[in-house]
């Protein structure tokens, strides 16, 4: 079974403290649901509410939980801690760094003459209804789960290339004399709560996670 990503590409640090706090509220609701008789959880799929029995134990396995997937009663606040989030930079830090150093928000990094090779945008997506699973099949994504009278939406933190026609533009700062380059959105698979017939089930679904530069050497013209 594939591993869920544990790290986010540099420059798109997910607000971990916020994520943990919201995840804690989900855990609390689940504990209450487990102690209640017949823990039936209503789930909303593609805008339609159906009473689907979701076993609270579905949420017990943390091993495959990705920081890019969040169950929350409220939209995640992207701009809450701007000094910690460090959304600006792409590729300026080690891939596996989990704690970013604080930077003064009044001195954004680009003032120091640092650029990302490819421009990208990141948002929490809370209205995903369908996705492609790891087998290439289209699946229905659970929009909401109602646990103990609290409605939790399923959010995905997605990163994509900002430039809609990246092949035309090339990557920033690449020597175009010797290299062909373009920016492209790359994907990863994350565990998400989906519908499997009439049951809710965890599946790996594909989401946009980074914008990277693709290089190929230009053919050398012989004299």
């Amino acid at each position: 079974e594939p591993h869920s990503e544990s790290n986010v590409p540099a420059g798109h640090t997910i607000p971990q403290a916020h994520w943990t706090k919201l995840q804690h509220s989900l855990d609390t609701a689940l504990r209450r649901a487990r102690s209640a008789p017949a823990a039936a959880i209503a789930a909303r799929v593609a805008g339609q509410t159906r009473n689907i029995t979701v076993d609270p134990r579905l949420f017990k396995k943390r091993r495959l939980r990705s920081p890019r997937v969040l169950f929350s009663t409220q939209p995640p606040r992207e701009a809450a801690d701007t000094q910690d989030l460090d959304f600006e930079v792409g590729g300026a830090a080690p891939f596996n760094r989990t704690h970013r150093s604080k930077r003064s928000s009044s001195h954004p990094i680009f003032h120091r003459g640092e650029f990302s090779v490819c421009d990208s945008v990141s948002v929490w997506v809370g209205d995903k209804t369908t996705a492609t699973d790891i087998k290439g099949k289209e699946v229905m994504v659970l929009g909401e789960v109602n646990i103990n009278n609290s409605v939790f939406k399923q959010y995905f933190f997605e990163t994509k290339c900002r430039d809609p026609n990246p092949v035309d533009s090339g990557c920033r700062g690449i020597d175009s004399k010797h290299w062909n380059s373009y920016c492209t959105t790359t994907h990863t698979f994350v565990k998400a709560l989906t519908m499997d017939g009439k049951q809710a089930a965890w599946r790996f679904i594909r989401i946009d996670t980074a914008c990277v530069c693709v290089l190929s050497r230009k053919a050398v013209r012989r004299a």
Partner: antibody, heavy 114, light 110 residues
Framework: SVEESGGRLVTPGTPLTLTCTVS????????MGWVRQAPGKGLEYIGW?????TAYYASWAKGRFTISKTSTTVELKITSPTIEDTATYFC????????????WGQGTLVTVSS | AYDMTQTPASVSAAVGGTVTIKCQAS??????LAWYQQKPGQPPELLIY???TLASGVPSRFKGSGSGTQFTLTISGVECADAATYYC????????????FGGGTEVVVK
């Protein structure tokens, strides 16, 4: 710095090219945007040209405007001006992250009248 | 389209008072929002970017907040120099530029 030029009185249908001259800005690293403002009205995003040279336009501006650039200038061509194109045209540098316009020129006034 | 709707169109405030301007995006734009201040006969000037970060040299009485689709610009302790028109702008979607700027809010200081 950013400075626009080329604004003048033109008759409808006469093509006009506005020039944005930059200094201290590497156009191979920064994208540049064109914004206009009709007298007494709000700001209207016409389009932008990426550091790689690809131009993007608002849907209403497609076919009516052409954005191009050299190493030190960005040009906006109004292909067939109409009375509604009377406005002050601003050129501005777009930051490479978060995508806002941080350095603006003073603008150049285009008046279209018969 | 990622349409930006700004309210109110005009607001009046006394010196020392507080002004609140709202900007709504038709779709989720995360925190890719900027606020600009424009005085008559001048180009717009960047005030706030990334929804809440003050641009260099901007006084702390200006505050930006919000993310997703709802954003707010608050001016506390309004001064005469704050009389201007304020615009919000989405920086998330680079293909849909039709209403990238809000309609503007004129702030009149009494």
């Amino acid at each position: 710095s950013v400075e626009e030029s080329g604004g003048r009185l033109v008759t409808p249908g006469t093509p006009l090219t506005l020039t944005c001259t930059v200094s201290g800005i590497d156009l191979s690293m920064y994208s540049m945007g064109w914004v206009r403002q009709a007298p007494g009205k709000g700001l209207e995003y016409i389009g932008w040209i990426s550091y790689g040279g690809t131009a993007y336009y608002a849907s209403w501006a497609k076919g009516r405007f052409t954005i191009s650039k050299t190493s030190t200038t960005v040009e906006l061509k109004i292909t067939s001006p109409t009375i509604e194109d009377t406005a002050t045209y601003f050129c501005a540098r777009e930051t490479p992250v978060n995508y806002y316009l941080d350095i603006w020129g003073q603008g150049t006034l285009v008046t279209v009248s018969s | 389209a990622y349409d930006m709707t700004q309210t109110p169109a005009s607001v009046s405030a006394a010196v020392g008072g507080t002004v609140t301007i709202k900007c709504q995006a038709s779709e989720n734009i995360g925190s890719y929002l900027a606020w600009y201040q424009q005085k008559p006969g001048q180009p717009p000037e960047l005030l706030i970017y990334r929804a809440s970060t003050l641009a260099s040299g901007v006084p702390s009485r200006f505050k930006g907040s919000g993310s997703g689709t709802q954003f707010t610009l608050t001016i506390s302790g309004v001064e005469c120099a704050d009389a201007a028109t304020y615009y919000c702008q989405q920086g998330y979607n680079s293909e849909n530029l039709d209403n990238a700027f809000g309609g503007g809010t004129e702030v009149v200081v009494k």
